[in-house]
């Protein structure tokens, strides 16, 4: 039985040209994490394999950095990076857990303007 839950950073926004950390956390299970895949829609961004370590897809190598932890850092953001991101935890013996993050990349002025009205 799959008892675990994935906690994610949820819906986040970031400024064009900036960077953002995509973070998921698997809790409430003792299952062993064998691999974590990070995907954007159907495109593979990165893999973190328990034995083989991190692998960034060649097309993202210049803009994606592994970590912190099992998370992923996206750099030099563009408006085209807006969309859904998925962390897919492959575990033993539970199976697969999936978390979803929605990233909105905003034009600099919009992001700054929006920040003024954020509730602390």
């Amino acid at each position: 039985m799959m008892t675990g839950t994935i906690e994610t950073t949820g819906n986040i926004s970031a400024e064009k040209g900036g960077s953002i950390i995509l973070q998921c956390h698997l809790s409430s299970t003792t299952a062993q994490v064998t691999q974590v895949n990070w995907e954007q829609q159907d495109q593979l961004l990165a893999i973190c394999n328990a034995d083989l370590g991190w692998h960034i897809s060649p097309s993202f190598k210049d803009r994606v950095a592994p970590g912190p932890g099992l998370g992923l850092t996206l750099q030099s953001l563009t408006v085209n990076d807006t969309g859904e991101y998925f962390c897919i935890y492959h575990t033993y013996p539970d199976g697969t857990y999936t978390g979803r993050i929605f990233l909105e990349v905003l034009e600099s002025s919009v992001a700054e303007h929006g920040a003024r009205f954020q509730i602390p």
Epitope: N49, D51, G53, H55, S57, P58, H90, T96
Partner: antibody, heavy 122, light 107 residues
Amino acid sequence: QVQLVQSGAEVKKPGASVKVSCKASGYTFRSYYMSWVRQAPGQGLEWMGIIDPSGGRTSFAQKFQGRVTMTRDTSTSTVYMELSSLRSEDTAVYYCARARYPESWPYGMDVWGQGTTVTVSS
Amino acid sequence: DIQMTQSPSSLSASVGDRVTITCRASQSINSYLNWYQQKPGKAPKLLIYAASSLQSGVPSRFSGSGSGTDFTLTISSLQPEDFATYYCQQSLLTPFTFGGGTKVEIK
């Protein structure tokens, strides 16, 4: 051209170890993962494990854990697979095979060695 | 481990026939599936990677399709040199398991 050349056939007694080599040429050795696959007589393909020639990290099928070692020598562009505590069921052809894309997750194996026959018999 | 099940285990066909081989994974593997051809006494040869991408130098009569758990290799018009054994393999998670193989024989 891209080539993987394996060492010659071996005959071993049960309980012994065998070390098979696979020498790569024609490409940047450190950039491509190398898998080992075996095939018992009349049987299908069985994936044994993989090595990253750059850092030396390995991953093995559970069946071979504790019995297999995969190493590499970057100076000679050679990978090695050593299997210990041999039994008759280990009689097979052993292949090394290169991942098809450099510096990436190993999606498929596009270049294969010629195979090394290992016979385990008392 | 992910189990890969191929069907049929063998089939008989004639030159010119359309041949379809299926492969099922025990869990979703997205499109991380490869197809290999092996002839007796020879090393396997990569035909298709990422479920549907044709490996360089492979004739266009070979095609792959599918995603998730169900995949298909199709030979549109079987040629004499295509009589061989075909294997699927998943490359999502280590260990990168193979299917049991499908032997294509002459009818």
